[in-house]
């Protein structure tokens, strides 16, 4: 039975040319996190592994940076960077779990930031 | 830190037996599958068989099917081989390995690869 | 069974030379295929999974390339302790199978 619940910074903004931290803590489990894949849409930006370390797809790796933790730095942000990621819990033995975060990215310099999440 | 250690080789008669274990620690050990891998002396490396988490799916080798049991006790975190009707080929480094699983989401399946292995432990087969 | 072919055999190059190895598969592994390092008397060391994702800690002048039935494993500038065997491996299907090894060895 999955018990999990995945906690996440939720709906973000930022601002055009600047960075963020994607966050996401699963939590209420004794289950094993063997890998954490981010997903932009359908496309993969990056995966945590627990044995064999961090991947950034091709693509994305001038502008993703791992950490902090299981999280993502994004840098170098533009208007197209807007919108849904997730964060997918691949434990063992629950199965997956999955977290939804939202992006604006704007032009404004008084983007509003999401409050900063913290891993406990 | 991940440790696998071998123990049980030594020199052994053909049709003999013998049995290996594999004592770990530093992980918890029910959440992984493990393998035995062995290498001849001067040659290249074979798998020989893998056991799931829970014990549940064995796989072999051809060459060893029906001579070898690959066993493990969570409670102990040991994994063994039993290897009974031994031949000169059997002669080999066995090594305990423990999977590293990768999710492929492109395939929707997981991967089993090799991050961490013991030291060995030999076994020779001879009259 | 899947048959792994390396070549060459043996690789005779002096360090900061490039190294380049191959394997091929008897039919088609996808991406599942990783690349080891074994020092003698030494553990096998896994180098590549995925067929080009580099393991934890291992230095980026080792990469990885190719998909389906042929793979190659580069060495970008020869270290002193890059001289060793390499082996690939499928982990496609059970059971799973190594390539005969290549030796890096310095000329």
């Known amino acids: 039975m999955m018990t999990g619940t995945i906690e996440t910074t939720g709906n973000i903004s930022a601002e055009k040319g600047g960075s963020i931290i994607l966050q996401c803590h699963l939590s209420s489990t004794t289950a094993q996190v063997t890998q954490v894949n981010w997903e932009q849409q359908d496309q993969l930006l990056a995966i945590c592994n627990a044995d064999l370390g961090w991947h950034i797809s091709p693509s994305f790796k001038d502008r993703v940076a791992p950490g902090p933790g299981l999280g993502l730095t994004l840098q170098s942000l533009t208007v197209n960077d807007t919108g849904e990621y997730f964060c997918i819990y691949h434990t063992y033995p629950d199965g997956t779990y999955t977290g939804r975060i939202f992006l604006e990215v704007l032009e404004s310099s008084v983007a509003e930031h999401g409050a900063r999440f913290q891993i406990p | 830190e991940v440790q696998l250690v071998e123990s049980g080789g030594g020199l052994v008669q053909p049709g003999g037996s013998l049995r290996l274990s594999c004592a770990a620690s530093?992980?918890?050990?029910?959440?992984?599958?493990m393998s035995w891998v062995r290498q001849a002396p001067g040659k290249g490396l074979e798998w020989v068989a893998n056991?799931?988490?829970?014990?549940?799916?064995?796989y072999y080798v051809d060459s060893v099917k029906g001579r070898f049991t690959i066993s493990r006790d969570n409670a102990k975190n040991s994994l063994y081989l039993q290897m009974n009707s031994l031949r000169a080929e059997d002669t080999a480094v066995y090594y305990c390995?423990?999977?590293?699983?990768?999710?492929?989401?492109?395939?929707?399946?997981?991967?089993?690869?090799?991050?961490?292995w013991g030291q060995g432990t030999l076994v020779t087969v001879s009259s | 069974e899947i048959v792994l072919t390396q070549s060459p055999a043996t690789l005779s190059l002096s360090p900061g030379e490039r190294a380049t190895l191959s394997c091929r598969a008897s039919q088609s592994v996808s991406s599942y295929l990783a690349w080891y390092q074994q020092k003698p008397g030494q553990a096998p060391r896994l180098l590549i999974y995925?067929?080009?994702k580099r393991a934890t800690g291992i230095p980026a002048r080792f990469s990885g390339s190719g998909s389906g039935t042929d793979f190659t494993l580069t060495i970008s500038s020869l270290e002193p302790e890059d001289f060793a065997v390499y082996y690939c491996?499928?982990?496609?299907?059970?059971?799973?199978?190594f390539g005969g090894g290549t030796k890096v060895e310095i000329k």
């Open positions: 390995a423990r999977v590293s699983y990768y999710y492929d989401s492109s395939k929707l399946r997981w991967a089993e690869y090799f991050q961490h």
């Open positions: 530093g992980f918890t050990f029910s959440s992984y599958g």
């Open positions: 995925d067929a080009s």
């Open positions: 491996q499928q982990v496609h299907n059970f059971p799973l199978t």
């Open positions: 056991i799931k988490q829970d014990g549940s799916e064995k």
